[in-house]
């Protein structure tokens, strides 16, 4: 079906980790030969249309806004392109999660939060009273779903050897395998500072 064409992209213009009732803009890569672009959500192996954009001449990539994010809107999204009456192309998939459905977990560190490049740190996400199956560690400002994920309880996330790019604000979330797109309220934040200057003064607050 795809022939020699690369798979078109789908992307979120902001974080795909979206607070309950928040919003996100989704962009589908424009395809020259498509006269219609549809945004679909995939639920239980069935596709449901969320929105559609007709092709206009020299138009930029079609965008769709998901408003009032909730449990029904969390999940896997795909762009569907109509090439002809019976011809379709599909983009890659995008996963959106909604946060704020359960009580929060707790994020802690095994050492101070100011690091030198090359050092190691482990962040632990725990929830003594809510039996989450899994935890995800998110860095503020990232435009993709958190790569750090654990099925342990508590969950240990090893960061390191660190470089300057590791600096940032981290939070963790708890969730259940049965509902992988429905996440907890965010944990407390931890700000990691990676600096190659030992003369800087940094303070952290709890």
């Amino acid at each position: 079906q795809e022939g020699d064409f690369p798979m078109p992209f789908i992307s979120a213009k902001s974080s795909p980790v979206i607070p309950l009732d928040g919003s996100v803009k989704i962009q589908c890569q424009a395809i020259r030969e498509a006269y219609l672009t549809q945004l679909m959500i995939i639920k239980n192996s069935t596709y449901r249309e969320i929105g559609r954009r007709l092709k206009f001449w020299n138009e930029t990539d079609p965008e769709f806004v998901i408003d009032h994010m909730d449990a029904n809107k969390a999940g896997r999204y795909q762009c569907q392109y109509r090439i002809g009456h019976y011809r379709f192309r599909y983009s890659d998939t995008l996963e959106l999660v909604v946060t704020g459905l359960y009580g929060k977990p707790f994020l802690s560190a095994d050492r101070g939060l100011v690091l030198m490049p090359g050092e190691n740190i482990s962040l632990t996400c725990s929830s003594a009273h809510i039996p989450f199956d899994r935890f995800s560690l998110a860095k503020e400002g990232e435009l993709s779903l958190p790569q750090h994920q654990s099925g342990e309880h508590p969950a240990n996330f090893s960061l390191g050897p660190v470089d300057l790019n590791v600096s940032g604000i981290y939070r963790c979330y708890g969730w259940y395998n049965r509902s992988p797109y429905l996440w907890s309220f965010p944990s407390n934040a931890l700000e990691l500072v990676v600096t190659d200057s030992i003369h800087q003064d940094y303070t952290t607050q709890n």
């Epitope: 704020g100 009273h129 039996p131």
Partner: antibody, heavy 119, light 107 residues
Framework: QVQLVESGGGVVQPGRSLRLSCAAS????????LHWVRQAPGKGLDWVAV????????YFADSVKGRFTISRDNSKNTLYLQMNSLRAEDTAVYYC????????????WGQGTLVTVSS | AIQLTQSPSSLSASVGDRVTITCRAS??????LAWYQQKPGKAPKLLIY???SLEGGVPSRFSGSGSGTDFTLTISSLQPEDFATYYC?????????FGPGTKVDIK
Amino acid sequence: QVQLVESGGGVVQPGRSLRLSCAASGFTFSSYVLHWVRQAPGKGLDWVAVISDDGRNKYFADSVKGRFTISRDNSKNTLYLQMNSLRAEDTAVYYCVREGYSGSWFDYWGQGTLVTVSS
Amino acid sequence: AIQLTQSPSSLSASVGDRVTITCRASQGISSALAWYQQKPGKAPKLLIYGASSLEGGVPSRFSGSGSGTDFTLTISSLQPEDFATYYCQQFNSYPFTFGPGTKVDIK
């Protein structure tokens, strides 16, 4: 010591608006999740709304959804509850509540401010 | 929403009595339950969190137990300052909910 002091309550007519404030002191305000909880005269406790430490995550009870908004100003150590389209059943003492740092129980409560909705 | 029911709704007891209050959740909440004490005209005060952990500064005569759907608050020897209304609260999932309360008064 931790202090939460609510203000802005009073008597208001049905359909009108009111904004409650909660001034916090004695802790690092920007690190804590905060809630509003209310209690109608002679009745039990009723959870109203929550806001995350950075203000991004919010959640409301169904009874106030679409009418109340919660916000915070971390530079002023203040929590707000904007109440629109008030109804008689919104009459209550409104408490500003701090959530525990490591879990979602309520470890500190303000003294409350009374909102009376009456014509 | 998860519903919490408390029993009894009120009870009369004497100083020195052992008092037990129960809280039942409409679905499992693991140990995500807290207990609060409220006296007339005052704000509630946290006693127990995580079903069984005693909040700092709370007398050891208060204890909590249970997990899943059934929880208990016990006052081992009732003191004059314990006459109040007690509420359970679940923090497992939003919206957070409270039980209707149990009023403990003097026999």
